[in-house]
């Protein structure tokens, strides 16, 4: 039960995380005009990975796409790549994890196969989360560098010539969405990896070996946490361990409403 919950929760957390990564990648507010200690302009500038926007004080907003690939900074290209890799890995991870979910039955899929799939999706989520966090962090670092450079330029004018006031940019909402989303995807991936350990069957987990002593029978399960002792010959149907491993009779059960999505 705990394994199923961990796996399910990991899936949901990763799903939210990946949705957040996609949202952050599409958002226009990666960097927003710094309004603090800056000559106040009647327009508000903000930029995303794909386009830059200007909001007039009237509320009219105009966005322009970056219609060039070669003319863009290498760092921006790198951030785009990291975010896309994160989304692709996350999407594949989600697809794999759907089939790996313990509550979903697909034919006669072995638990060992589900465990492997859970581990695979978990690793994919971890890498996806790391890609997103890395992408957002690289962009944030770029912003910080540019912010202080433009601040320096603001105060070292052109020696009496026309002074240009540079628009400084600070962290936009997308950065925070990206960091949180990356973190959630990472956590979801870790949870999937933890769930995998509980799912992974040890060879003996499914075979209850009975040792018959005179007078009473003891069912001993080498891989389990409990040794069940009982009188009579009821050992075959006895539920030995409720942590996911089952006796042979229990393995085959009727489909319930939770078996299909």
């Amino acid at each position: 039960m705990a394994v199923t919950a961990c796996q399910g929760l990991g899936f949901v957390v990763s799903l939210i995380g990946i949705a957040g990564i996609i949202a952050a990648t599409c958002m226009d507010q990666w960097s927003t005009q710094d309004l603090y200690n800056n000559p106040v302009t009647a327009v508000f500038n903000y930029q995303g990975l794909w386009r830059s926007c200007v909001r007039e004080s009237s509320g009219f907003t105009e966005c322009r796409g970056y219609f060039t690939l070669l003319g863009l900074p290498a760092m921006l290209q790198a951030v785009r790549a990291l975010m896309i890799v994160g989304i692709v890995l996350g999407a594949i991870g989600l697809l794999v994890s759907i089939f790996a979910l313990k509550c979903i039955r697909i034919g006669s899929m072995e638990d060992s196969a589900k465990a492997n799939m859970t581990l695979t999706s978990g690793i994919m989520f971890i890498v996806s989360g790391l890609c997103a966090i890395a992408g957002v962090s690289v962009f944030a670092n770029m912003l910080v560098t540019n912010f202080w450079m433009s601040t320096a330029n603001m105060y070292t004018g052109m020696g009496g010539m026309v002074q240009t006031v540079q628009t400084r940019y600070t962290f936009g909402a997308a950065l925070f969405v990206g960091w949180v989303a990356g973190g959630l995807t990472l956590i979801g991936g870790v949870m999937m990896c933890i769930a995998c350990r509980g799912l992974a069957p040890e060879e003996t987990n499914y075979k209850a070996v009975s040792y018959h002593a005179s007078g009473h029978s003891v069912a001993y399960k080498p891989g389990g946490f409990k040794a069940s002792t009982g009188f009579g010959s009821n050992t075959k149907n006895k539920k030995i361990y409720d942590g996911g491993a089952r006796t042979e009779d229990e393995v085959q059960s009727y489909p319930s409403k939770h078996d299909y999505v």
Epitope: T41, A42, S57
Partner: antibody, heavy 119, light 113 residues
Framework: QVQLQQPGTELVKPGASVKVSCKAS????????MHWVKQRPGQGLEWIGR????????NYNQKFKGKATLTVDKSSDTAYMQLNSLPSEDSAVYYC????????????WGQGTLVTVSA | DIVMTQSPSSLTVTAGEKVTMTCKSS????????????VTWYQQKPGQPPKLLIY???TRESGVPDRFTGSGSGTDFTLTISSVQAEDLAVYYC?????????FGSGTKLEIR
């Protein structure tokens, strides 16, 4: 069509206050900024400030802070500018102007109110 | 505050002539975000309120005759009237509508011979 109606003249005594009105018609009053501009006789134009009727958010020229107060009455689609403790050099034509949608320019202007400060 | 310097302060021309007036700002009025210059030109005829002619330095307001052309970028801007008509007698103001407070130039008075 867009119209901004202002009273033609206001005569006030030095040190007194005056409230200049600007009644808007022909457009959605709450959707556009209302600007106020001062023009002394034979002189250039000076931006006083602006107010957004939807939420009364405003920006002032530092020079006119404390001198001018911008307000709106949404129920009557009217913008007001109160000028306090007027000296004779505040005698001027005061225009209200509707902000444009696409840019920050002033698309339509009222005819102006001549405020005369005289004893 | 941004200083808008207009020149000449006045000029007298004959109808049909081409006229050019300039406006220089103390800081760049080009917004990098949308590559637009936030300069507006107004025409004020005697006894009338100003009228919007050109915004974003070069975009003509609807209804404005195409003999009026705005150009320039950064700090230097120009208003050109390709063929002056008698009704163009007015004072022309340029305005910074990028930085607060919005500021106007001192105006160029156009007189017809």
């Amino acid at each position: 069509q867009v119209q901004l109606q202002q009273p033609g003249t206001e005569l006030v005594k030095p040190g007194a206050s005056v409230k200049v009105s600007c009644k808007a018609s022909g457009y959605t009053f709450t959707s556009y900024w209302m600007h106020w501009v001062k023009q002394r006789p034979g002189q250039g134009l000076e931006w006083i400030g602006r107010i957004r009727p939807s939420d009364s958010d405003s920006n002032y020229n530092q020079k006119f802070k404390g001198k001018a107060t911008l307000t709106v009455d949404k129920s009557s689609d009217t913008a007001y500018m109160q000028l306090n403790s007027l000296p004779s050099e505040d005698s001027a034509v005061y225009y209200c102007a509707m902000g444009a949608y696409f840019s920050n320019s002033f698309a339509y202007w009222g005819q102006g109110t001549l405020v005369t400060v005289s004893a | 505050d941004i200083v808008m310097t207009q020149s000449p302060s006045s000029l007298t021309v004959t109808a049909g002539e081409k006229v050019t007036m300039t406006c220089k700002s103390s800081q760049t009025l080009l917004n990098r975000g949308n590559q637009k210059n936030y300069v507006t030109w107004y025409q004020q005829k005697p006894g009338q309120p100003p009228k919007l002619l050109i915004y974003w330095a070069s975009t003509r307001e609807s209804g404005v005759p195409d003999r009026f052309t705005g150009s320039g970028s950064g700090t230097d801007f120009t208003l050109t009237i390709s063929s002056v008509q008698a009704e163009d007698l007015a004072v022309y103001y340029c305005q910074n509508d990028y930085f607060f407070p919005f500021t106007f130039g001192s105006g160029t008075k156009l007189e017809i011979r």
